[in-house]
Interface confidence: medium
């Protein structure tokens, strides 16, 4: 059955209640110069509007502090109001390593990110840090790598490993959850000139992730004891017509091309899904596509296999799909899938359908295919036009969390965390934020607060209290380090 009655119950005490943000652009300088500059200034407000130094007067200075970054203050204020236990944000690779290699490290950017993490920890909020978060508009690569063919060039994978190593070294004492790459399975939207470009770029992204994971496993895990994965875009697929076999096959094919494409090599076999390989090969034989999945060497298969510590899924909606034979040598046409917009469904302004039961089906599918592993939903949310009373978002959160709870309580899926997307919206973008672009809070925050403090949807008389030992204590030593390690 699709919709089942709501359940009453709670998530475990160590469940991660999170909120996700995309790339945090580092502030280049702390914006409180009065603490580092000993001079006094007078502002000529009516004349030339410049600051004029007052000679002969010297002020006491103090060392720079993390809260001197205006941005960080804003982040912390929003996070404190969210009452989350975890904050997922992404570093800006191009800011940290502008040259793409370790020859020019932007220490100020790293200091900024360290501040975000350490100040969060003081509020009891642990970080899940994403190393690379490409967006459709911008690949987010350092310029030299972009000009050297980006992800079509295998050496970008090695550059990523070096960057990851730097981040593990600089932040790994405080960060215990890492995402290497956000939604590599969506870079097909950018590398879409041909299927071979798409599959070639995906191959190098897989290698980049595996190299970073193995570096962490070998050099950093023994002392830092963290966990590393990558986040896959993981919308569920349903047949548009449940009575048509071809639609059922199309739905499974969508999951193979969208999720298994990356999950199979990393979680299971070290190679691409047989179903995907065979489907592309059959189209190739019939002259409908010249695409081909890369043939992996034995060494590449061994490199990829098993390089995840948990499963991280970004889930937003369910797509209704049907089979339609498409000619052309691109990823989109290789799948032979057509999407159907069901206008009877509750949908957002950007046409995201609200289909809560899809997330439960997804979680069961992942467990059935890849085994009983820890799963985090690392981004989940909806756009809502309302600037204050965002009722669609409240409805979405409540219903989707209900289905996640069913997966936990009834299906026994090892769900470890839910990260709502996203903290603050950006100007002129779909409104996914809990806060507006000028930091005004929306009413969905109170709703999420309530779910977090109740640990779900408890029975009337059940306690939501957790003992200190049961709570998420993944970074007990972090607070000590925050005080002791210089920023």
């Amino acid at each position: 059955k699709e919709s089942t009655p709501d359940v009453q119950g709670q998530f475990p005490c160590d469940f991660s209640w999170g909120v996700t943000e995309s790339v945090l652009k580092p502030e280049s300088v702390a914006s409180s110069p009065q603490f580092s500059d000993p001079h006094l200034y007078v502002w000529n407000a009516t004349g030339n509007r410049l600051l004029h130094r007052v000679e002969g007067v010297r002020l006491k200075t103090r060392p720079a502090q993390c809260t001197d970054f205006v941005n960080i203050k804003k982040q912390l204020e929003m996070l404190a109001r969210m009452k989350v236990t975890h904050y997922r944000f992404a570093l800006d690779w191009a800011s940290v390593l502008p040259t793409g290699n370790l020859s020019a490290v932007n220490r100020q950017a790293l200091r900024y990110y360290r501040c975000v993490v350490s100040e969060g920890l003081k509020l009891g909020i642990s970080a899940m840090v994403t190393l690379y978060y490409p967006t459709h508009a911008h690949l987010g690569l350092p310029e030299p790598l972009l000009h050297a063919d980006g992800w079509l060039n295998p050496s970008t994978a090695e550059a990523f490993q070096a960057y990851a190593g730097l981040c593990f070294q600089e932040l790994g004492d405080l960060v215990k959850l890492w995402i290497t790459i956000n939604e590599p399975n969506r870079l097909s939207d950018i590398y879409n000139r041909s299927g071979n470009d798409t599959y070639g770029a995906a191959h190098n992204l897989l290698v980049a992730h595996a190299l970073a994971w193995r570096l962490y496993d070998r050099q950093f895990r023994p002392s830092q004891r963290g966990a590393v994965s990558l986040s896959l875009h993981a919308d569920w697929a349903e047949p548009a017509n449940p009575y048509a076999d071809s639609h059922w096959r199309a739905a499974e094919r969508f999951l193979q091309f969208e999720i298994a494409w990356f999950a199979e090599p990393l979680f299971k076999t070290g190679d691409y899904p047989a179903a995907m390989r065979e489907y592309i090969a059959s189209k190739h034989r019939r002259g409908l596509s010249s695409s081909a999945l890369p043939r992996l060497t034995e060494a590449e298969r061994r490199l990829l296999k098993g390089t995840v510590d948990f499963c991280a899924l970004n889930h937003f909606t369910t797509r209704f799909v049907m089979h339609e034979q498409l000619a052309g040598s691109r990823y989109d046409s290789d799948r032979d899938i057509q999407f159907l917009q069901d206008i009877t469904r509750l949908s957002s302004p950007t046409r995201l359908a609200v289909i809560p039961w899809g997330v439960r089906k997804l979680l069961r599918w992942v467990r059935r295919n890849y085994g009983d592993m820890d799963i985090y939903i690392t981004a989940s949310g909806i756009d809502d036009q309302a600037l204050e009373d965002d009722r669609l978002r409240k409805y979405y959160l409540g219903k989707y969390l209900q289905e996640v709870l069913k997966a936990y309580l009834i299906d026994k899926v090892r769900i470890k965390g839910y990260y709502a997307f996203k903290l603050a919206e950006e100007k002129s973008k779909p409104r996914f934020g809990f806060f507006t672009s000028d930091f005004k809070a929306k009413s969905s925050i109170q709703f999420y607060n309530k779910v977090i403090s109740s640990r779900g949807f408890p029975f009337e008389n059940s306690s939501s209290r957790c003992s200190q030992t049961q709570e998420n204590t993944e970074c007990t030593v972090c607070l000590f380090l925050v005080q002791k390690k210089p920023l």
Partner: antibody, heavy 120, light 111 residues
Framework: QVQPQESGPELVKPGALVKISCKAS????????INWVKKRPGQGLEWIGW????????KYNEKFEGKATLTADKSSSTAYMQLSSLTSENSAVYFC?????????????WGQGTLVTVSA | DIVLTQSPDSLTVSLGQRATISCRAS??????????MHWYQQKPGQPPKLLIY???NLESGVPARFSGSGSGTDFTLNIHPVEEEDAATYYC?????????FGGGTKLEIK
């Protein structure tokens, strides 16, 4: 210290079988292949096969199919190689070696070797 | 199976000079930007020690006087300047496909 520890020398009779062990430490045992390599006096090195302790999957050099059986015990972080129907050809030093972290399949960490002597 | 042929079988090099060892594969061991060829040093009574991985990458802790080069089917290990402790047998190994194979070995003596 990541270097694997292999079991001691074995003197066995022709036709018998022997099981040698390789205990791993200093890293997560389930995440890296353990390879086995044969070295006979005056001859080169021969790769026998690997086992991936994470799921117990194995791959063998065809030459050693039916001769060598690779297993792993996750609870004790120990890999084993059993050699059956032994002949004098099987007298050799057997090394276990952990693969590197690049997936290049080069062997970074080697055990000290176990000498197996097959003699009546 | 890919056959690796090392040459020479043995060589004697004066202290401080250059030693060059070749390894030829019966088919290419390079693909998608990588050359799956590695070099090891083995001394009597000891396990082999990895020197070079992926044709040209120096394993950590190995002196910089060791270097590797090549792609496709032809690979070279260079040692310069040779030191007394370099007396050993050197093996190449490929991991392009199964089964992995080793070269026959080159015995280096120092005079």
């Amino acid at each position: 210290q990541v270097q694997p520890q292999e079991s001691g020398p074995e003197l066995v009779k022709p036709g018998a079988l022997v099981k040698i062990s390789c205990k791993a430490s200093g890293y997560t045992f389930t995440r890296y292949d353990i390879n086995w390599v044969k070295k006979r006096p005056g001859q080169g090195l021969e790769w026998i096969g690997w086992i991936y302790p994470g799921d117990g999957s194995t791959k063998y050099n065809e030459k050693f199919e039916g001769k060598a059986t690779l297993t792993a015990d996750k609870s004790s972080s120990t890999a084993y190689m059993q050699l059956s129907s032994l002949t004098s050809e099987n007298s050799a030093v057997y090394f276990c070696a952990r693969s590197d972290y690049y997936g290049s399949r080069s062997f970074v960490y080697w055990g000290q070797g176990t000498l197996v002597t097959v003699s009546a | 199976d890919i056959v690796l042929t090392q040459s020479p079988d043995s060589l004697t090099v004066s202290l401080g000079q250059r030693a060059t060892i070749s390894c030829r594969a019966s088919k290419s061991v390079s693909t998608s930007g990588y050359s799956y060829m590695h070099w090891y040093q083995q001394k009597p009574g000891q396990p082999p020690k990895l020197l070079i991985y992926l044709a040209s990458n120096l394993e950590s802790g190995v002196p910089a006087r060791f270097s590797g080069s090549g792609s496709g089917t032809d690979f070279t290990l260079n040692i310069h300047p040779v030191e007394e402790e370099d007396a050993a047998t050197y093996y190449c190994q490929h991991s392009r496909e199964l089964p992995y194979t080793f070269g026959g070995g080159t015995k280096l003596e120092i005079k």
